[in-house]
């Protein structure tokens, strides 16, 4: 139930953390599974445990197997497992899967590789960075803390990353490296409901007559490119162009916006001249596409 | 405001099963460890089963293999299924919190405390 | 298991008056992280337990001053400055090192 698997190569270090919940004052125990014997905490030793961590400087082949560790907490102590295995190193470029993190997913607007398990280390900018075993080099590629960012993702871009980095312990160095495969996706849109932003439902609006006045009715469809989206006005539940007053016309063409990524319509209702009679018809803000059409209702008074 | 609500009890036939419920509000429910503890009338108070935030359950010898212990983050709720009840399980049940896996600072014991459930097993 | 015993078991105490509770463990509540795992509650007629004292010597939020715990190890003390009618109910002493056991209870009652 709390076991973690971890892993690494041979030489390299390898820091695992005690999959069970700790708080500084509480001491964690280590143990080798198998022979139930005690990990050392001196750090003269090249296995140690150090809280809830437990440190490989460097790791070997024959350090593979079940550790436990145990949080000395009031009331309960806490059990968990760390199965670590160590590899030999690949003489070839090829990763085994067996060596991969997790996958993590890219796109044009957001394309950061986290450096798998670097919080655990005791590590100093730069990291390297390889794709594919060769050295990323180039302006779209920037090391930024524990990540990395591509500039432009392209679908050439997925593949292997790894990143390199030096652990320091006591005026000790030893290199780390983690891989993991990164893939790019095609922003994905979709279309909802629309949602009317203004005006609100049953608003009241105040003009003053003989001026101008505009009403904006706006509206939101959904993620990228909508096939069927629209937004108008009608006056009294007829379109305006049918209404047959000159004053009172919507503004041609139709403003496209990109609200929180979400693509948006607004249309204005331009009133000149602002007459006694205006105040008694019903604006209605109309938003529709494939999903239906939604309505909002607006009304004019004079404003004091 | 911090507050447990207990629900559930109730009078139930010896061998029989009782499930109680606890509601919580007012606090981050998913980082803290939860207990029942019952108190048999007229007497002391005595602990019978415990989760802790990651999940792991802990139980006294006298309800172990009877009674378990449960919860739902989401739901906010701890739930404890008593099976095999027997006339030594006449109690209140109280549900109570527990320590605070977000604070490294102090633990407080058992520092909120439901109404309690009064459960009574009798044929 | 730690068991915990308390003396005496039941008090009667005039208004304005001392009282002291005494509640000792069958083992060390020291824990590893140098804490000291002892609480104190008091449960009122028809009430849940409320928490008074934890760690041994520090008052809960909102309990008034006249309430204090001392002690170490495995010999620990309630004690109440001057007791009020307020203050009548059953005061436990309980320990969480090792799972949770409490005490029999001291019965407290105004003369």
């Known amino acids: 139930k709390f076991s973690k698997q971890s892993w690494g190569l041979e030489n390299e270090a390898l820091i695992v953390r005690c999959p069970r919940q700790g708080k500084p004052s509480y001491t964690v125990d280590w143990y080798y599974s198998q022979t139930n014997k005690s990990i050392p905490t001196q750090e003269r030793n090249r296995v140690f445990a150090s809280g809830q961590l437990l440190k490989f400087l460097p790791a070997e082949v024959a350090d593979s197997g079940i550790y436990t560790c145990i949080v000395r907490s009031p009331t309960f102590n806490r059990t968990g497992y760390a199965n670590v295995t160590i590899y030999k190193k690949q003489s070839d470029c090829n990763v085994p899967d067996y060596l991969m993190y997790s996958t993590v997913s890219g796109s044009e607007k957001n394309s950061k590789i986290y450096c798998p398990t670097i919080d655990l280390y005791n590590w100093t900018a730069p990291l390297e960075w390889f794709k594919n075993c060769q050295a990323l080099q180039g302006s779209r590629y920037r090391a930024h803390k524990s990540f990395l960012v591509i500039d432009n993702v392209m679908t050439e871009d997925a593949g292997d990353y790894t990143c390199k980095f030096i652990h320091n312990e006591n005026g000790a160095n030893y290199s780390v490296t983690a891989t993991r495969s990164f893939t790019v996706k095609d922003e994905q849109g979709f279309s909802l409901f629309p949602v009317i932003g203004a005006p609100a439902q049953n608003e009241i609006k105040e003009v003053e007559i003989g001026k101008n006045a505009n009403l904006t009715c706006s509206a939101c469809f959904g993620k990228g490119t909508q096939f069927l989206a629209a937004v108008l006005w009608q006056l009294n539940g007829t379109k305006i162009t049918d209404f047959g007053e000159p004053r009172i016309q919507q503004e041609e063409g139709q403003n496209q916006s990109f609200s929180n990524g979400l693509a948006c319509l607004d249309m204005v209702l331009r009133i000149a001249d602002v007459k006694e009679e205006d105040l008694l018809l019903q604006y209605d803000c109309l938003a529709l596409n494939l999903h239906g059409l939604r309505r909002h209702t607006v009304r004019l008074s004079r404003k004091n | 405001e911090v507050q447990l609500v207990e629900s559930g009890g109730g009078l139930v036939q010896p061998g029989g099963s009782l499930r109680l419920s606890c509601a919580a509000s007012?606090?981050?429910?998913?980082?803290?460890?939860m207990h029942w503890v019952r108190q048999v009338p007229g007497k002391g108070l005595e602990w019978i089963s415990s989760?802790?935030?990651?999940?792991?359950?802990y139980y006294p010898g006298s309800v172990k293999g009877r009674f378990t212990i449960s919860r739902e983050n989401a739901r906010n709720s701890l739930y404890l299924q008593m099976n095999s009840l027997r006339a030594g399980d006449t109690a209140v049940y109280y549900c109570?919190?527990?320590?605070?896996?977000?604070?490294?600072?102090?633990?407080?014991?058992?520092?909120?405390w439901g109404q309690g459930t009064t459960v009574t097993v009798s044929s | 298991n730690i068991v915990m015993t308390q003396t005496p078991l039941s008090l009667s105490v005039t208004p304005g008056q001392p009282a002291s509770i005494s509640c000792k463990s069958s083992?060390?509540?020291?824990?590893?992280?140098?804490?000291?795992?002892l609480f104190w509650y008091l449960q009122k007629p028809g009430q849940p337990p409320q928490l008074l004292i934890y760690?041994?010597?520090n008052r809960f939020s909102g309990v008034p001053d006249r309430f204090s715990g001392s002690g170490s190890g495995t010999d620990f003390t309630l004690k109440i400055s001057r007791v009020e009618a307020e203050d009548v109910g059953v005061y436990s002493c309980?320990?969480?090192?090792?799972?949770?056991?409490f005490g029999p209870g001291t019965k407290v009652d105004i003369k």
């Open positions: 109570t919190r527990g320590e605070d896996w977000s604070d490294d600072d102090y633990y407080y014991g058992l520092d909120v």
């Open positions: 007012g606090f981050t429910f998913s980082t803290f460890d």
């Open positions: 989760i802790d935030t990651e999940g792991d359950t």
């Open positions: 083992q060390s509540l020291l824990h590893s992280d140098g804490k000291t795992y």
């Open positions: 760690g041994v010597s």
């Open positions: 309980m320990q969480s090192l090792q799972l949770f056991t």
